[in-house]
Interface confidence: low
């Protein structure tokens, strides 16, 4: 998707309807990128991302990607199309109203990823092991 | 956060003109349908106007009601809605709310009086 | 313009109640329909959009149903905060309509 900054009209006229006909409003997400974070060892954590964004197209989600390695951890808030895939993985939890996050296998580096359907709802990210039980010592984050 | 605040609204004598503000953060404004919704004193909502992005044009809709004597207008560069009233008349006297076309902000509204 | 008609104009209940609003449109508006909550001195809040999907941090209890011409609000157990004034709204096309409000007040 076009990120915030960049200069892109929001086609409010494009009709996107769901499996019941209701019409998708385009989604409001947390749109920071990446940014450097200190989101470790919680339940949950806010993304402490101000910049709220109205997503290019209606079908769009919001999504969260948290990352670990020897170096930093980083969070990253966009919008995203769930038709497609991102960082090579499928958003199987597009329709989900909370952003829960899941661990993905990435080499070198510990790798969760979210989605959600529901205004800016990557705000709130959950690793929560009521949700997740892929990593049972992760707990919920809250950035400074 | 995302924040909507109006200002400018005031007493005003019938056939005068007014000129509303709408200072937006906390979202990309310039992304952003805007509108203008309105609410006569004990009575109900009342869509006033929107604008539409500045890169599709800027066009604007309006209620036949204010058709003719408002306008609407932006400021992508300070994220600031305008709502220009001009032949004010006495039924034109409400809260003024700015929305993000009718999405979940709103403003808390600013009273516009229209009277002799 | 599409006229929007909501029934009751009000309504007197108690905590604990079901409580259902019906709007109706002049014509067909699909799914475009919106409710709001409006409480005293304070600007209207979005709970339902698309005539059934719940805003992002409205209480379960609320609830949208219909298509067409014919819609409901429900609050399935109405709490002490839910005392207000409630609009439909149709955004199928311009101008965007509002019903003329049902208030619910304590019985």
């Known amino acids: 998707t076009i990120p915030p900054h960049v200069q892109k009209s929001v086609n409010n006229d494009m009709i996107v309807t769901d499996n019941n006909g209701a019409v998708k409003f385009p989604q409001l997400c947390k749109f920071c990128d990446v940014r450097f974070s200190t989101c470790d060892n919680q339940k949950s954590c806010m993304s402490n991302c101000s910049i709220t964004s109205i997503c290019e197209k209606p079908q769009e989600v919001c999504v969260a990607v948290w990352r670990k390695n020897d170096e930093n951890i980083t969070l990253e808030t966009v919008c995203h199309d769930p038709k497609l895939p991102y960082h090579d993985f499928i958003l199987e939890d597009a329709a989900s109203p909370k952003c829960i996050m899941k661990e993905k296998k990435k080499p070198g580096e510990t790798f969760f990823m979210c989605s959600c359907s529901s205004d800016e709802c990557n705000d709130n990210i959950i690793f929560s092991e009521e949700y997740n039980t892929s990593n049972p010592d992760l707990l919920l984050v809250i950035f400074q | 956060q995302v924040q909507l605040v109006e200002s400018g609204g005031g007493l005003v004598e019938p056939g005068g003109s007014l000129r509303l503000s709408c200072a937006a953060s906390?979202?990309?404004?310039?992304?952003?349908?805007m509108s203008w919704v309105r609410q006569a004193p004990g009575k109900g909502l009342e869509w006033v106007g929107r604008?539409?992005?500045?890169?599709?044009?800027?066009?604007?809709d309006f209620a036949a009601p204010v058709k003719g004597r408002f306008t609407i207008s932006r400021d992508d560069s300070k994220n600031t809605l305008y709502l220009q009233m001009n032949s004010l008349k006495t039924e034109d006297t409400a809260v003024y709310y700015c929305t993000l076309d009718l999405r979940k902000y709103w403003g808390q509204g600013t009273l516009v009086t229209v009277s002799s | 313009d599409i006229q929007m008609t909501q029934s009751p104009s009000s309504l007197s209940a108690s905590v604990g109640d079901r409580v259902t609003i019906t709007c109706r449109a002049s014509?067909?508006?699909?799914?475009?329909l919106n409710w709001y909550q409006q409480k005293p001195g304070k600007a209207p809040k979005l709970l339902i959009y698309?005539?059934?999907s719940l805003q992002s941090g409205v209480p379960s209890r609320f609830s949208g149903s219909g298509s067409g011409t014919d819609f409901t609000l429900t609050i399935s157990s109405l709490q002490p905060e839910d005392f207000a004034t409630y609009y439909c709204q149709q955004s199928y096309s311009t101008p965007p309509t509002f019903g003329q409000g049902t208030k619910v007040e304590i019985k």
């Open positions: 604008i539409k992005t500045t890169y599709s044009g800027g066009a604007t």
């Open positions: 906390g979202f990309t404004f310039a992304n952003a349908w």
């Open positions: 014509q067909s508006i699909s799914s475009y």
């Open positions: 698309a005539a059934s």
